[in-house]
Structure formats: structure tokens, C-alpha cells
């Protein structure tokens, strides 16, 4: 009778950094330069990511892990794994199709990325504006107007005694 062959795939013995070489009797061969395998048992290696142009290398590719990119100064990463670089703007601006534009009145952006957002509407919380907003900063809300009116504190001082016959001034 024919002996049962081992069910284990010989390629499963090939560690990260190698591939299972079918041309050489399934022995483990090292990944060629500029490629990697991050898991064992792979039949091919993956080509390393190239950080070119506006991308710069944050972490070099190794035989077991891909290169990692970030963006050159003046740009910031977008997308998973920094798949895109987007131009920075100044605080108080947002990036449009025509480039960086100042935030419209009533909006602000306190970062070099993202969009201009509306100032907080203090009155929705029954508060007043303590510090006005700018293109770069949101408004600062203060106590409600009622909190600021005289005699509105929780502990009211006693009213001064009035002498009879004296009308209030």
C-alpha cells in the first residue's frame, strides 16, 4: 500500500523574509533585494513600496516588512498607511481646488490641514461670547447673560434697610 503523504505543506516551514521556491524543490529562498515577505509560507515575496517624489522614507524596507512613507515638509499624510500626501495650508485657511484659501467670516481652522469649521454658537448653550472668533481660533463662550446680571448669583447679599419716608434714589 502507498504510505500516506504528510498533509503538512513543506512551504509552511519557510519563515518571513523568504519564499517557497517551487523551482528548487520547495526550499526556502531569501527574498530578493527590494522585496519582503512579512509572513511565513509565502510562494512569492512582495515588492517593497517606493517612497518617491513628495513621499519620503520613514522606515526602510527589510526582508520581513514593507517600507513606510511619510510626506516631505509642507505636506501631510492622508489615507491608510499614508497613501497620499496633501499640501499643508496655514492656520486660518483650507485647501480648495484652487489652492489654500482664507476661512470665510464665521469659520476657523486652527490646523494646517482640514477644512474651515463654523464658530461655536454660544447662544445655543445659553452662553455669551467671551472672546470673539478669528480665522484661526474658535470663539470662547462665557457664562450666560443671566449669570452676569446683578443679583443673579446663588448667594444674594441682604438688601440695605430703608428709612421710612425716604424714596429710593
Amino acid at each position: 500500500f502507498e504510505r500516506t503523504r504528510s498533509l503538512q505543506d513543506p512551504c509552511s516551514n519557510c519563515p518571513a523574509g523568504t519564499f517557497c521556491d517551487n523551482n528548487r524543490n520547495q526550499i526556502c529562498s531569501p527574498c530578493p533585494p527590494n522585496s519582503f515577505s512579512s509572513a511565513g509560507g509565502q510562494r512569492t515575496c512582495d515588492i517593497c513600496r517606493q517612497c518617491k517624489g513628495v513621499f519620503r522614507t520613514r522606515k526602510e524596507c527589510s526582508s520581513t516588512s514593507n517600507a513606510e512613507c511619510d510626506c516631505t515638509p509642507g505636506f501631510h499624510c492622508l489615507g491608510a498607511g499614508c497613501s497620499m500626501c496633501e499640501q499643508d495650508c496655514k492656520q486660518g485657511q483650507e485647501l480648495t481646488k484652487k489652492g489654500c484659501k482664507d476661512c470665510c467670516f464665521g469659520t476657523f481652522n486652527d490646523q494646517k490641514r482640514g477644512i474651515c469649521r463654523p464658530w461655536t454658537n454660544c447662544s445655543l448653550d445659553g452662553k455669551s461670547v467671551l472672546v470673539n472668533g478669528t480665522k484661526e481660533r474658535d470663539v470662547v463662550c462665557g457664562p450666560s447673560p443671566a449669570d452676569l446680571s446683578p443679583g443673579a448669583s446663588s448667594v444674594t447679599p441682604p438688601a440695605p434697610a430703608r428709612e421710612p419716608g425716604h424714596s429710593p434714589q
Epitope: F19, D21, N34, T44
Partner: nanobody, 122 residues
């Protein structure tokens, strides 16, 4: 048919130099990613050096940096490995290798030659 023929190996004393050649046929060496792989006695394959893409960017293993230089002569369709300051641990069979790119996006390599033996010993 793709063929790679290595030559230039031999016995050399520690500190000595050798130049290996790899004559390619069946493909244009300048249009491919190629390099050198070695196998020391009782050990697995180790990448030594490579020339990648048509721009000619080069790779060297840490163990040979500053001592080995890879180059190619496009007119002769030949790849070279200039080895200097040789050490006993450089003793191995040296193979010329050609990258193989697969449809799924992966990469392996192809060894078509018999290799050339380099022995560093006093």
C-alpha cells in the same frame, strides 16, 4: 531561452581580489533586475548584491558593503561582481540571479547557471 553563465571564481588568499562575470543570453541585462546570490558550504542562499531597474540603483548585503561592487556592461550583456578585501567567510558558490515578477504582484528569482566557486584561504 534564458541562460546565465558565471565565471571568474577561484582560490584566493584573504585580502585578495576577484572579478566574477555573468554572461546573459535570451534577455537583455540592462532591462532586467539582476544580481548575485551565494551559497556557503552547509548554508542557505544569501543575496550579495543586485542592480535594480533601468536606473541602475544598487543593493549590497551589509556583510559585503564597501568591499564588493556590482556593475554591468550593456554592450556585452554581462553582469560583474568585483570583490576585494576577501575574507574566509566569503567562501561560497556564487550564482547570477534574475528577478522574476509574477502576475499577482509577487517577485521571486531565477538561477539558471551552475555558479562559480570562490574559495578564500591561506
Amino acid at each position: 531561452e534564458v541562460q546565465l553563465l558565471e565565471s571568474g571564481g577561484g582560490l584566493v588568499q584573504p585580502g585578495g581580489s576577484l572579478r566574477l562575470s555573468c554572461a546573459a543570453s535570451g534577455f537583455t541585462i540592462s532591462a532586467e533586475d539582476v544580481g548575485w546570490v551565494r551559497q556557503a558550504p552547509g548554508k542557505g542562499l544569501e543575496w550579495v548584491s543586485a542592480i535594480l531597474d533601468s536606473g541602475g540603483s544598487t543593493y549590497y548585503a551589509e556583510s559585503v558593503k564597501g568591499r564588493f561592487t556590482i556593475s554591468r556592461d550593456n554592450a556585452k550583456n554581462t553582469l560583474y561582481l568585483q570583490m576585494s578585501s576577501l575574507r574566509a567567510e566569503d567562501t561560497a558558490v556564487y550564482y547570477c540571479a534574475r528577478y522574476v515578477y509574477h502576475a499577482g504582484g509577487g517577485v521571486t528569482f531565477d538561477l539558471r547557471g551552475q555558479g562559480t566557486q570562490v574559495t578564500v584561504s591561506s
